[in-house]
């Protein structure tokens, strides 16, 4: 079956800036600002667009070692990001996949609203544990607040962007600011 859970949360960060940091550069930021939640993000294949596969590794103490995500859509204009958890943990046993949609909407006060949809595609008659839904929501909140805190502390980061290619970033092209580049050289 398919079980859909929707949630909304707010941020004081403007939508465009939050999209750049939280979505487009989350692979870099999450292990740095929330190492208790994500230890590393590795690009397995693709360049960040649809079809890209990422391996998200979890720190010691969490029940599963990693999951793999597949990017399904990146809409830079409407600040939309769709991806699916396709491997690792319970995927392949009780769950076929978890499809996620994130849309960041600008608010009149200069902040933003994140609209999040999580669709759990279960195998057979398996149901989704309430604890799983809660954990997913809490993890999203943890990552968001960690990124938000980082952006508030680094007011120049993820504003005026340049597309650069750096060996220090694994040779991949990344959206990054001059001030952020300094941090990455020492990361």
């Amino acid at each position: 079956g398919v079980f859909n859970y929707e949630t909304e949360t707010t941020s004081v960060i403007p939508a465009a800036r939050l999209f750049k940091a939280f979505i487009l550069d989350g692979d870099n930021l999450f292990p740095k600002v929330a190492p208790q939640a994500i230890s590393s993000v590795e690009n397995i294949e693709g360049n960040g667009g649809p079809g890209t596969i990422k391996k998200i590794s979890f720190p010691e103490g969490l029940p599963f070692k990693y999951v793999k995500d597949r990017v399904d859509e990146v809409d830079h204009t409407n600040f939309k990001y769709n991806y699916a958890v396709i491997e690792g943990g319970p995927i392949g046993d009780t769950l076929e996949k978890i499809s996620n949609e994130i849309k960041i909407v600008a608010t009149p006060d200069g902040g933003s609203i994140l609209k999040i949809s999580n669709k759990y595609h279960t195998k057979g008659d398996h149901e989704v544990k309430a604890e799983q839904v809660k954990a997913s929501k809490e993890m999203g909140e943890t990552l968001l607040r960690a990124v938000e805190s980082y952006l508030l502390a680094h007011s120049d980061a993820y504003n005026e962007q340049k597309l650069i290619s750096e060996e220090d970033l694994g040779g991949e092209q990344k959206l990054i600011s001059e001030e952020d580049l300094h941090h990455h050289h020492h990361h």
Epitope: G61, P63, F64, D93, E131, A135
Partner: antibody, heavy 123, light 108 residues
Framework: EVQLVQSGAEVKKPGESLKISCSGS????????IAWVRQMPGKGLEWMGL????????RYSPSFQGQVTFSVDKSINTAYLQWSSLKASDTAMYYC????????????????WGQGTLVTVSS | DIQMTQSPSSLSASVGDRVTITCRAS??????LNWYQQKPGKAPKLLIY???SLQSGVPSRFSGSGSGTDFTLTISSLQPEDFATYYC??????????FGQGTRLEIK
């Protein structure tokens, strides 16, 4: 059906080596950590550590570090626990169990469990 | 390491009784607490995960509660097959994962 099946009981002499096995079926073996748990006669459960079948990553409990060795053969969905030189104090029931839990949280538990392998070390 | 202390270590009860077993952690473990049942000569079996969630296939007479440092396992109406040893286990701070010392439930 998700299950773990362990090798049979062993009787050994002090100083001998031993390798016992735990075979998983009914689930994606490489997605889950396998834990080993010791239960000495008439005593409680002691967590020995974990091994991840995907890449053989190992976490030993400090109490068992250097005393035992974990290994895995993911091609046959089997984990192993071994001793290079057994002692009388290694006499116990040894269980393997799958670490399950809630993704993105610290909620972790053990289910299912193997039937246990009784190891007796006596001269 | 987080220490888990169960009480009582053993108790006697009769069929139909309501029984409560407690587990105390040496520091807060949120709700990351599980309960297992072990019958003589058998492997442990998961009863309750995440402090209060009943594992699939476990009778509803078993329930769990608590958060932080204090947790309870309750059997609302004891059945003959419930006489066993019960263990709590924390997964908040690992390694190592730690179990309580066990509570032996005997027939009065």
């Amino acid at each position: 059906e998700v299950q773990l099946v362990q090798s049979g009981a062993e009787v050994k002499k002090p100083g001998e080596s031993l390798k016992i096995s735990c075979s998983g079926s009914g689930y994606r073996f490489t997605n889950y950590w396998i834990a080993w748990v010791r239960q000495m006669p008439g005593k409680g459960l002691e967590w020995m550590g974990l091994i991840h079948p995907d890449d053989s990553d190992i976490r030993y409990s400090p109490s068992f570090q250097g005393q035992v060795t974990f290994s895995v053969d993911k091609s046959i969905n089997t984990a192993y626990l071994q001793w290079s030189s057994l002692k009388a104090s290694d006499t116990a029931m040894y269980y393997c169990t799958r670490q399950d839990g809630i993704l993105w949280s610290h909620n972790a538990w053990f289910d299912p469990w193997g039937q246990g392998t009784l190891v007796t070390v006596s001269s | 390491d987080i220490q888990m202390t169960q009480s009582p270590s053993s108790l006697s009860a009769s069929v139909g009784d309501r029984v409560t077993i407690t587990c105390r952690a040496s520091q807060s473990i949120s709700s990351y607490l599980n309960w297992y049942q072990q019958k003589p000569g058998k492997a442990p079996k998961l009863l309750i995960y995440a402090a209060s969630s009943l594992q699939s296939g476990v009778p509803s007479r078993f329930s769990g509660s608590g958060s932080g440092t204090d947790f309870t396992l309750t059997i609302s109406s004891l059945q003959p097959e419930d006489f066993a040893t019960y263990y709590c286990q924390q997964s908040y701070s690992t390694p190592p994962i730690t179990f309580g010392q066990g509570t032996r439930l005997e027939i009065k």
